[in-house]
Interface confidence: low
């Protein structure tokens, strides 16, 4: 599930992070949701994925890889703009919808190569593939219109990820699951 490191990360890796909270360790918090999030790793100088429990934690937690890089990697946006000029659509944009096998229900977006648009789909929380974005804006920037200027910025509204347990199981199981909101 881990995102591959960008060249821009290693190019900027020796610099100090922009904010003190970028130096904090990833903190999943005490709750039990499984929300894919990102943190800045002081040791690798890269933004990396971790699974957030849905409550508490700390400020070194971002909904998207892009947001993490912008916040914690000095000069990232400048370098990213340079890298994006004439950008091509990454191969993973053409992957089929893959909800994965786990039974959490997360609202995600994927690029549909038939309609040439980013669309909503439901992700199960594990496995799956990289044609899977937390926000419509991120999907559009990477797959629909790569290198095509800035995205929504502050207009991009991050909806809280919700996981709701699947209620039906094999008939003999009694469920005592909690809903995480």
């Amino acid at each position: 599930l881990s995102e591959e490191a960008d060249d821009t990360d290693s190019e900027l890796g020796s610099m100090k992070p922009l904010h003190t909270f970028c130096a904090m360790k990833a903190d999943d918090g005490p709750c039990k949701a499984m929300i894919r999030s990102y943190f800045f790793n002081m040791y690798t100088h890269q933004c990396e994925e971790f699974i957030y429990g849905g409550c508490e934690g700390n400020e070194n937690r971002f909904d998207t890889l892009e947001e993490c890089k912008k916040t914690c990697i000095p000069g990232y946006e400048k370098t990213a703009v340079k890298a994006a000029s004439g950008a091509e659509r990454p191969d993973f944009c053409f992957l089929e919808e893959d909800p994965g096998l786990c039974r959490g229900y997360m609202k995600r977006y994927l690029y549909n190569n038939q309609t040439k648009q980013c669309e909503r789909f439901v992700y199960g929380g594990c496995l799956g593939n990289r044609n899977n974005f937390e926000t419509l804006d991120e999907c559009k920037k990477i797959c629909e219109n790569p290198g095509g200027g800035s995205g929504g910025g502050l207009n991009d509204i991050f909806e809280a990820q919700k996981i709701e347990w699947h209620e039906g199981g094999p008939p003999h199981h009694h469920h005592h699951h909690h809903h995480h909101h």
Partner: antibody, heavy 120, light 113 residues
Framework: QVQLVESGGGLVQPGGSLRLSCAAS????????MSWVRQAPGKGLEWVSA????????YYADSVKGRFTISRDNSKNTLYLQMNSLRAEDTAVYYC?????????????WGQGTMVTVSS | QSVLTQPPSVSGAPGQRVTISCTGS?????????VHWYQQLPGTAPKLLIY???NRPSGVPDRFSGSKSGTSASLAITGLQAEDEADFYC????????????FGGGTKVTVLG
């Protein structure tokens, strides 16, 4: 009552092929991801492969990738594992299991297993 | 070598409390993924004992309990009984491996006397 019954195991020579089946009953088969897990004699459990409820997504452990193929026929409530280019290290009891019904990534119900022996 | 590490064996007298540890890393248990436990009685298939770190499926006695902290998890059996003699396996999910689903090596629980 939920039941999984594996069949198709047996003795096969190295390089040979075998197809395992798992007949499911007592639940809505097409609603659940299914998986194969194996256990070599005297050893621990090893995840082999998994498939989504629709059959559209499949996943494999590195040790079997390119040699094994998981599939399902939802009209027959049956899960399959096609095993090609078998090796001695594939010798194990193969279990089919329902994946992720009660909790993310747990194997809820297991079959009784079928023994596969790869030997010359 | 299993991705999740369990002690090969633990033992206890009837009525005693025994615990089995399951140690992982920051890419599996430490990343927030659930831990599940299975009991395998001699000559039988594994059975789900604890799911989602600490939940018991119906029919599992409350003598069995699970917990998770940091990069490790543990299974406790209180009031050990002769019929608890079995192999116990922990299992989780690992985001750093293409294998993804990972098991511990198993722990043999022996009931003494």
């Amino acid at each position: 009552q939920v039941q999984l019954v594996e069949s198709g195991g047996g003795l096969v020579q190295p390089g040979g092929s075998l197809r395992l089946s798992c007949a499911a009953s007592g639940f809505t088969f097409s609603s659940y991801a299914m998986s194969w897990v194996r256990q070599a004699p005297g050893k621990g459990l090893e995840w082999v492969s998994a498939i989504s409820g629709s059959g559209g997504s499949t996943y494999y452990a590195d040790s079997v990738k390119g040699r094994f193929t998981i599939s399902r026929d939802n009209s027959k409530n049956t899960l399959y594992l096609q095993m090609n280019s078998l090796r001695a290290e594939d010798t194990a009891v193969y279990y089919c299991a329902i994946l992720g019904a009660t909790s993310l990534s747990a194997f809820d119900i297991w079959g009784q297993g079928t023994m596969v022996t790869v030997s010359s | 070598q299993s991705v999740l590490t369990q002690p090969p064996s633990v033992s206890g007298a009837p009525g005693q409390r025994v615990t089995i540890s399951c140690t992982g890393s920051s890419s599996n248990i430490g990343a927030g993924y659930d831990v599940h436990w299975y009991q395998q009685l001699p000559g039988t298939a594994p059975k789900l004992l604890i799911y989602g770190n600490s939940n018991r499926p119906s029919g599992v006695p409350d003598r069995f309990s699970g917990s998770k902290s940091g990069t490790s998890a543990s299974l406790a059996i209180t009031g050990l009984q002769a019929e608890d003699e079995a192999d116990f396996y922990c299992q989780s999910y690992d985001s750093s491996l293409s294998g993804s689903v990972v098991f511990g090596g198993g722990t043999k629980v022996t009931v003494l006397g």
